[in-house]
């Protein structure tokens, strides 16, 4: 069964700056990745970035830089200042659309006892849903 993992990290240099990393553990080819916060995309969540493997990347504040890390994983850096900045208990979700598996989504947030610069290991997150 395909899985999606989400890793959230607070940057040591900028305490209100976050890096989200997401990956897809499956054999299919990824056609789209959507990163949202505040809940799953389409269920109250707000889209931060959309990454397409050929057409490129769209991103919205407070996203600062989204990028593909590998063919099956992405990273997103969020701005650390401003009214729309994330806080420590913000939930981030990543939805991977792939063929032939369909859409898979997982969510995660900063581990409660995280020191700046540290993060939870990139294990599959608890919220997992196939469309």
């Amino acid at each position: 069964t395909p899985e999606v993992w989400v890793q959230v990290r607070m940057e040591a240099t900028e305490l209100s700056s976050f890096t989200i990393r997401c990956g897809f553990l499956g054999s299919g080819s990824i056609s789209l990745v959507t990163v949202s916060w505040g809940g799953p995309n389409g269920a109250g969540g707000t889209t931060l970035a959309v990454l397409h493997p050929e057409r490129g990347i769209r991103q919205w504040a407070p996203a600062r830089q989204a990028r593909w890390e590998t063919q099956s994983s992405i990273s997103l850096i969020l701005e650390g200042s401003g009214a729309s900045s994330p806080c420590a208990n913000t939930t981030f979700c990543c939805k991977f659309a792939s063929f032939p598996e369909g859409s898979w989504e997982a969510c995660g947030s900063l581990p409660p006892s995280s020191d700046p610069g540290l993060s939870a290991p990139p294990t599959p997150a608890p919220i997992l849903r196939a469309d």
Epitope: S31, T46, T47, H52, R55, G56, W60, A61, Q65
Partner: antibody, heavy 123, light 107 residues
């Protein structure tokens, strides 16, 4: 037919602010992001940023963060760009141009542009 | 930021000629490139999107090709109305960036 009608030329003093407008017609305003592009003889075309009129979400070129503020009014199908703390470096032609919001759309590019607004900053 | 380099600022051509305008990206942008034509005093007009697809109403003498880092806009059988500036745009990642432009002029 699709039209992006931009506001007229502006002559403003250094240090002032100005708001440029772009009125869209001939399509569903919320189906497309509105982007703004600056053009000067020295730097050519530079992407300033974008707004999604449906959500109000914005994206900015770091170079123009704090300089430009993008807003949109769904009721009048108009996008706005406020430029602050103007200097002579801001003298340019500014264009609005639309980009379809869905990444998997067939037509994925800036397909229509406004006629441009010339901004002159001079004392 | 991704830099889009149009190495030729000017290109001289004659009516009926075939001309190729090139654009090089500083990193792999897949096929996330568009081409625009701009005449003096006018706004840019879309020609090509996703590297090789023609915008509605663009004559078939305009052809786009390339992927990755190297892109080409070819105009076969150049017409006098084709004399203009041509820009490439990458939309692989933000900030979106344009090439400096290539001015097509008569010999």
């Amino acid at each position: 037919q699709v039209q992006l009608q931009q506001s007229g030329a502006e002559l403003v003093r250094p240090g002032a602010s100005v708001t440029l407008s772009c009125k869209a017609s001939g399509y569903t305003f919320t189906d497309y992001e509105m982007h703004w592009v600056k053009q000067t003889p020295v730097h050519g075309l530079e992407w300033i940023g974008a707004i999604d009129p449906e959500t109000g979400g914005t994206a900015y070129n770091q170079k123009f963060k704090g300089k430009a503020i993008l807003t949109a009014d769904k009721s009048s199908s108009t996008a706005y760009m406020e430029l602050r703390s103007l200097t002579s470096e801001d003298s340019a032609v500014y264009y609005c141009t639309r980009w379809i919001t869905t990444v998997v759309a067939t037509l994925y590019y800036f397909d229509y542009w406004g006629q441009g607004t010339t901004l002159t900053v001079s004392s | 930021d991704i830099v889009m380099t149009q190495s030729q600022k000017f290109m001289s051509t004659s009516v009926g000629d075939r001309v190729s305008i090139t654009c090089k990206a500083s990193q792999n942008v897949r096929t996330a490139v568009a081409w625009y034509q701009q005449k003096p005093g006018q706004s840019p007009k879309a020609l090509i999107y996703l590297a090789s697809n023609r915008h509605t109403g663009v004559p078939d003498r305009f052809t786009g090709s390339g992927s990755g880092t190297d892109f080409t806009l070819t105009i076969s059988n150049v017409q006098s109305e084709d004399l203009a500036d041509y820009f490439c745009l990458q939309h692989w990642n933000y900030p979106l960036t344009f090439g400096a432009g290539t001015k097509l002029e008569l010999k």
